[in-house]
Structures are given as C-alpha cells and as structure tokens.
Interface confidence: low
C-alpha cells in the first residue's frame, strides 16, 4: 500500500546518508505525516538548513574540506535572523571561519556556494575588513559590538561552522 512504499523509500534514503551521518534527527514538517526534514545528529536546524560547529582548529581551506566531507560547506550567512540563530551556539572567546573569502586580495568577497556577496547583508565589525592580505572571514565577539565579522589570514587555525541543506525524507 501507499504508506508501506513511502516507508521503504524513506529507509533507502536513510541508508544513502548513513555512510556520512550514522544518526539523523527528523521532525515532521507541518501537519503532513509524509513530510519529514532531518539534520544529522548532533547538528542544529534553522529554517531549511542544518548547522555544525566544528571545534577542531584548522586553516580555512582545511575547514572547508572538513565541511565538504560531511556533505556541507562553510557557513553562508544570508540574513540577520540566520546569524542571530548561529551565534546562540558559539562561544564568546572563540572565532569561527565563515564560507566567505577574498581569494585575489582585491576585496572581491565571495561565498563558497556562489551566493552573490551583498554589501547590504554583511555584518563586519566596524573598521573591518581592513587588510588585503587577510583573505578569509571569521565571526567573533567583541565586547563593544557583540558578534560580527573580521578578515584574518587564512592559514591561522580557527574553529568553523558548517552548513548544509536539510535532508527531506
């Protein structure tokens, strides 16, 4: 019957993801029992995305590779609401790589997923970015301005934030 075939499809989809994420946390979307959205355990979810705070300290490139192994990217922040959600899970004495870099050092910032860089939706600390040799962006806490972005050298190991689309089963 219909419910049985739906369940079989779900199970095969879950097996597909199991090699990367042994455990998924799923919630029912809306009122329809057929629509479930999942994030890997222990990732957090906000709107249509899942987030993972990586506490291992790595360079920007290695951090991005680490995210991609998990089927994600370094985080792309699209709205103030999204940033407000993310910072709830961050430690004030740490810095975290974003999926934002300026590879040519010419202040052409680009997101890892090719989302257009929109000056109007950026959250740089005042006076940042301030160094052409600092080509990668972090989010960190400054007591005067709370949470914001700063440009830093890409080789300096930092924690990082990974983001992936929710898994729908």
């Amino acid at each position: 019957n219909f419910m049985y075939s739906k369940t079989v499809k779900r199970l095969s989809k879950l097996r597909e993801y199991q090699q990367y994420h042994p455990s998924l946390t799923c919630v029912m979307e809306g009122k329809d029992i057929e629509d479930w959205s999942c994030c890997p355990t222990p990732w957090t979810s906000f709107q249509s995305s899942c987030y993972f705070i990586s506490t291992g300290m790595q360079s920007w490139t290695k951090s991005q590779k680490n995210c991609s192994v998990m089927g994600a990217d370094l985080v792309v922040i699209n709205t103030r609401e999204e940033q407000d959600f993310i910072i709830q899970n961050l430690k004030r004495n740490s810095s975290y790589f974003l999926g934002l870099s300026d590879p040519g050092g010419r202040r052409h910032w680009q997101w890892v997923d090719q989302t257009p860089y929109n000056e109007n939706v950026t959250f740089w600390h005042s006076g940042e970015p301030n160094n052409l040799d600092e080509r990668c962006a972090i989010i960190n806490f400054r007591s005067s301005e709370e949470w914001g972005w700063n440009d830093i050298h890409c080789h300096v190991p930092q924690k990082s934030i990974c983001k992936m689309k929710k898994i729908y089963i």
Epitope: S59, P103, D133, H153, H155
Partner: nanobody
Framework: QVQLQESGGGLVQPGGSLRLSCEVS????????MAWFRQATGKEREFVAA????????VYGDSVKGRFTMTRDHPKKMVYLQMDNLKPEDTAVYYC??????????????????WGQGTQVTVSS
Amino acid sequence: QVQLQESGGGLVQPGGSLRLSCEVSTDTFSSLAMAWFRQATGKEREFVAAISWSGASTVYGDSVKGRFTMTRDHPKKMVYLQMDNLKPEDTAVYYCAGDLDGRTWHGDDLEYDYWGQGTQVTVSS
C-alpha cells in the same frame, strides 16, 4: 604553466649563511602565495616559511624563527630565503612552492599547487 626553479644550495659550516632563490615563470606571480619547505633524509616534509601574495605578510616554522627571512621580488618574479646561523639540523633538500589562489599561504603542503625540484643544503663542519 607555472614552473619553479630553486638555486643557491650548497655546503656551509655551522653558524654560516646561505641565500636560496626561487625563480617563478608565470604571468600570475603577483597573485601567488609562496612558501619554502624542506625534507631531510628519512623525514617528513617540513614547513619552513611562507609569504603572502603582496609580500606584506610572512610566517615561519618554529625551528627557523629568528634565523631565516623570506622575501619576494615582484619585477624579477623571484622568491628568496635568507638563512643565517645555520645548524646541522637544517640539512635537507629545500623546496619552493606556490599556491595559485593566494588564499592559503601557510604551513600545509597539501595546499600548494606548484613545486620546484628542490636544492640541497648541507650544514656540516
């Protein structure tokens, strides 16, 4: 095609100095982050120094800090490693490396796209 050619290696006594050069043949030299690595016989490749695309920023491996200086000359498309107060443990083949996106100048050899053939440095009395 990016080609890197090291020179300047040789035999030197402990406490002596050497200057290694790396000639880079590419039109995109000014956007390359550059680095020096070394590999002693039977050991893993070790990070020595790196310099950002503009030359404004450098970073050094712990074992060479205060003794080695890395610079670059944009018009000549050259990178240099001035090595002073050399020690026997500095004996190794020294490699020049370049990273095309200029983003990842640091001590991880996996990040570098282009490599020279190496030049031997021997520190011995």
